[in-house]
């Protein structure tokens, strides 16, 4: 009897069962009752990542230098090309077919977590206690200068956006 | 137990054409694939036709394309090789195969073909 | 074509000995290669198929191994009744192709 169903990595065709060509490997001809699949690799360029009847391997993805993208991982007969963002900018999406720059933190704000190739800056506000007065991809929120270490007096009041202004303390006169 | 029996083989001239039969028994004919396979002098096998279980796809190599035609009635159990325009070079000992597992399973006892002036 | 070149063309043994037989194929066929028996003035007889899965009713010593383009057939402990010709045959695509053939002989 011909078969239904087929065992993993084959497929049925003309009520049997032939052999999948294996990842990096395009589909030649499909078997017959006196040969087996003929399958052939994908060219420079090209690509299978699965076991496969597919008649025409994948294009490697374009990594576009105008779009901000480079290189990450280079891509095989089995594998896709991983692009990532040039430094300083990072991907739109998960697929990385395009790169925005990095965003700043506003003054008032600092960074969280700095931007890679695939995730933009994290900013958080700046909480009572420190400050960030420049607009910057890369600068945490720094810690109000403590006047009473340098034997100092608060003559301004921080922000979250501008630091303490100490000053010397008022002497009594003798 | 599958038997294979070839005949129809013969001595005749270049040129000419002959028709061989192979009588199946023992299995489902229907249900397999069948070949013809040669073997000259020198013990050299050589592929010359296959011919799909229904019968709709037949297989040839270059070299005989054109001369010769694989057929089969599934209702007789009968596998045929009709061979024309033969060439001393044809002269050989014919087998019928049935393929199982896409291997050449069984074998007949084989027909001989000279093709001789 | 896939050229199939097998060594050696003859092959000299002493019974109880063990024999190695090449099959070399011009291009990669994966494993798709058959290997045949043929007894003198008898009928070649399937041993091998897939390059080394065993075949009902065929003594177990008789193996056989390789992908891609080399291919061994084993006989160990050769007996009187294994002379003969040994041929592989691919089936990795059209047209069919055989080797040239080992022969087997007493020595």
């Known amino acids: 009897e011909p078969p239904t169903a087929c065992r993993e990595k084959q497929y049925l065709i003309n009520s049997q069962c032939c052999s999948l060509c294996q990842p990096g490997q395009k589909l030649v001809s499909d078997c017959t009752e006196f040969t087996e699949t003929e399958c052939l690799p994908c060219g420079e360029s090209e690509f299978l990542d699965t076991w496969n009847r597919e008649t025409h391997c994948h294009q490697h993805k374009y990594c576009d230098p105008n779009l901000g993208l480079r290189v990450q991982q280079k891509g095989t007969s089995e594998t896709d090309t991983i692009c990532t963002c040039e430094e300083g900018w990072h991907c739109t999406s998960e697929a990385c077919e395009s790169c925005v720059l990095h965003r700043s933190c506003s003054p008032g704000f600092g960074v969280k977590q700095i931007a890679t190739g695939v995730s933009d800056t994290i900013c958080e506000p700046c909480p009572v206690g420190f400050f960030s007065n420049v607009s910057s991809a890369f600068e945490k929120c720094h810690p109000w200068t403590s006047c009473e270490t340098k034997d100092l007096v608060v003559q301004q009041a921080g922000t979250n956006k501008t630091d303490v202004v100490c000053g010397p303390q008022d002497r009594l006169r003798a | 137990e599958v038997k294979l029996v070839e005949s129809g083989g013969g001595l005749v001239k270049p040129g000419a054409s002959l028709k061989l039969s192979c009588a199946a028994s023992g299995f489902t004919f229907s249900n397999y694939g069948m070949s013809w396979v040669r073997q000259n002098s020198d013990k050299r096998l050589e592929w010359v036709a296959s011919i799909s279980s229904g019968g709709d796809d037949t297989y040839y190599p270059d070299n005989v394309k054109g001369r010769c035609t694989i057929s089969r009635e599934n209702a007789k159990n009968t596998l045929y090789l009709e061979m024309s325009s033969l060439k001393t070079e044809d002269t050989a000992l014919y087998y019928c195969?049935?393929?199982?597992?896409?291997?050449?399973?069984?074998w007949g006892q084989g027909t001989s073909v000279t093709v001789s002036t | 074509d896939i050229v199939l070149t097998q060594s050696p063309a003859t092959l000299s043994v002493i019974p109880g000995n063990s024999v190695s037989l090449s099959c070399r194929a011009s291009?990669?066929?994966?494993?798709?290669l058959h290997w045949y028996q043929q007894k003198s003035h008898e009928s070649p007889r399937l041993l091998i198929n897939y390059a080394s899965q065993s075949i009902s009713g065929i003594p177990s010593r008789f193996s056989g191994s390789g992908s891609g383009t080399d291919f061994t057939l084993t006989i160990n402990s050769v007996e009187t009744e294994d002379f003969g010709i040994y041929f592989c045959q691919q089936f990795n695509s059209w047209p069919l192709t055989f080797g040239g053939g080992t022969k087997l002989e007493l020595k």
């Open positions: 291009q990669s066929i994966r494993d798709n």
């Open positions: 195969t049935r393929a199982g597992g896409k291997a050449m399973d069984y």
